[in-house]
């Protein structure tokens, strides 16, 4: 029972997490325009992986699409690449995992395949959840370092009265949904290893041994020895791990040229 | 079409508030942002903040701060903006203006204006 | 705050003839995240209220007739009325839209001659 709720478990944050991994990629706010140098901003900036938008006063917003790959930057080519590995591992997973449920019969699957695909969709989930911290982690390392330099040249070029005001951006809603979509990910892959360890047999059927008495006919049957033989059949003895993760599901979306430098 | 009809005139002792109203009339009341711009005898336009009908959300020129006051009715459909401890230079014609909702936030529509006089 | 500057304070042109009015101001205008400039010019005519004739530095209010051209970017702009009729004797303002508070220049006030 435990081994069937560790995997449940395993399963359902890993599909909350999968799914904060798409709407985080989805956001358009990965990059907010600081406001802590300019906190009277008429119009509100923010970028997403595929378009940056424009919100005005009135409250309305324009967004528009980078309409070229070979414009942008490396690393936003190398966020992107990693954030959708990270779904489309994860949505393997999520498939591979739905037939590995120990509560779901599917014809005569044993458990041994059960256990197999377990694990499959438990490393899938947990270089799912990597690729997503990796691929937030390294935007956010790309506005640390785009900060600081916007920061030094903020008041580069000014020409007597006249302010040229360079645009910063600081860390938006979707890097905090993709830090906490990837954790829950891996948090749910770590839990589908450990049921798969639950869900391997560690049985050994040894032949039953008939003796025959004297003027009777019974057949004595010893149970079998329990020996750690990592696949074989049916498992009685299961091991209780038990896993909780809280997840943030919060996720807003507002309301061009790429603008990192 | 859209319409924005200010109060009458009103004459002041210095000290004293006015209170001016704006009553909107042609468009959705809490869908756009209204603003106040006033204009001193013979002088340019000056800003003097926002309200938001929607959320009653306000935003304030600091020159102004602590003497303006902002409020709406959505009832009526109706802005009003107060200003107090009147001085002789806060003589000048009160506008309401309706920011555009993609007009780059230019104000599209303006009130007739209200003439509010300072005076001992 | 930002501070707009136009000039000349006030010009006189012949009916038919060419108007320009220029806006400069103390921060740049332009949005870097939409390449857009937030500057508006108004007409007012004595006794009226504010008319907004462009927006977005460049874009013609609607039924704002086209011999009203706005054109500029950052912190310079122009306003050029390309053919001057009787009914455009007014005051001009431009205005910033892209920071609080918003501010107007001085006004340009325009005549006959």
């Known amino acids: 029972m435990a081994v069937t709720a560790c995997q449940g478990l395993g399963f359902v944050v890993s599909l909350i997490g999968i799914a904060g991994i798409i709407a985080a990629t989805c956001m358009d706010q990965w990059s907010t325009q600081d406001l802590y140098n300019n906190p009277v901003t008429a119009v509100f900036n923010y970028q997403g992986l595929w378009r940056s938008c424009v919100r005005e006063s009135s409250g309305f917003t324009e967004c528009r699409g980078y309409f070229t790959l070979l414009g942008l930057p490396a690393m936003l080519q190398a966020v992107r690449a990693l954030m959708i590995v990270g779904i489309v591992l994860g949505a393997i997973g999520l498939l591979v995992s739905i037939f590995a449920l120990k509560c779901i019969r599917i014809g005569s699957m044993e458990d041994s395949a059960k256990a197999n695909m377990t694990l499959t969709s438990g490393i899938m989930f947990i270089v799912s959840g990597l690729c997503a911290i990796a691929g937030v982690s390294v935007f956010a390392n790309m506005l640390v370092t785009n900060f600081w330099m916007s920061t030094a040249n903020m008041y580069t070029g000014m020409g007597g009265m006249v302010q040229t005001v360079q645009t910063r951006y600081t860390f938006g809603a979707a890097l905090f949904v993709g830090w906490v979509a990837g954790g829950l990910t891996l948090i749910g892959g770590v839990m589908m290893c450990i049921a798969c360890r639950g869900l391997a047999p560690e049985e050994t059927n040894y032949k039953a041994v008939s003796y025959h008495a004297s003027g009777h006919s019974v057949a004595y049957k010893p149970g079998g020895f329990k020996a750690s033989t990592g696949f074989g059949s049916n498992t009685k003895n299961k091991k209780i791990y038990d896993g909780g993760a809280r997840t943030e599901d919060e996720v807003q979306s507002y309301p061009s040229k790429h603008d990192y430098v | 079409q859209v319409q924005l009809v200010q109060s009458g005139a009103e004459v002041k002792k210095p000290g004293a508030s006015v209170k001016v109203s704006c009553k909107a009339s042609?468009?959705?009341?809490?869908?756009?942002?209204m603003h106040w711009v006033r204009q001193a005898p013979g002088q340019g336009l000056e800003w003097m903040g926002y309200i938001n009908p929607y959320n009653d959300g306000t935003k304030y020129n600091e020159k102004f701060k602590g003497r303006v006051t902002m409020t709406r009715d959505t009832s009526t459909s109706t802005v009003y903006m107060e200003l107090s401890s009147l001085r002789s230079e806060d003589t000048a014609v009160y506008y309401c203006a309706r920011l555009g909702f993609t007009t780059r936030n230019a104000m599209d529509y303006w009130g007739q204006g209200t003439l509010v006089t300072v005076s001992s | 705050d930002i501070v707009m500057t136009q000039s000349p304070d006030s010009l006189a042109v012949s009916l038919g003839e060419r108007a320009t009015i220029n806006c400069k101001s103390s921060?740049?205008?332009?949005?870097?995240?939409?390449?857009?400039?937030?500057l508006a010019w108004y007409q007012q005519k004595p006794g009226q209220p504010p008319k907004l004739l462009i927006y977005g530095a460049s874009t013609r209010e609607s039924g704002v007739p086209d011999r009203f051209t706005g054109s500029g970017s950052g912190t310079d702009f122009t306003l050029t009325i390309s053919s001057l009729q009787a009914e455009d004797v007014a005051v001009y303002y431009c205005?910033?839209?892209?920071?609080?508070?918003?501010?107007f220049g001085q006004g340009t006030k325009l005549e006959i001659k």
């Open positions: 921060q740049s205008l332009l949005n870097s995240g939409n390449q857009k400039n937030y």
């Open positions: 205005q910033n839209d892209h920071s609080y508070p918003f501010t």
């Open positions: 042609g468009y959705t009341f809490t869908s756009y942002i």
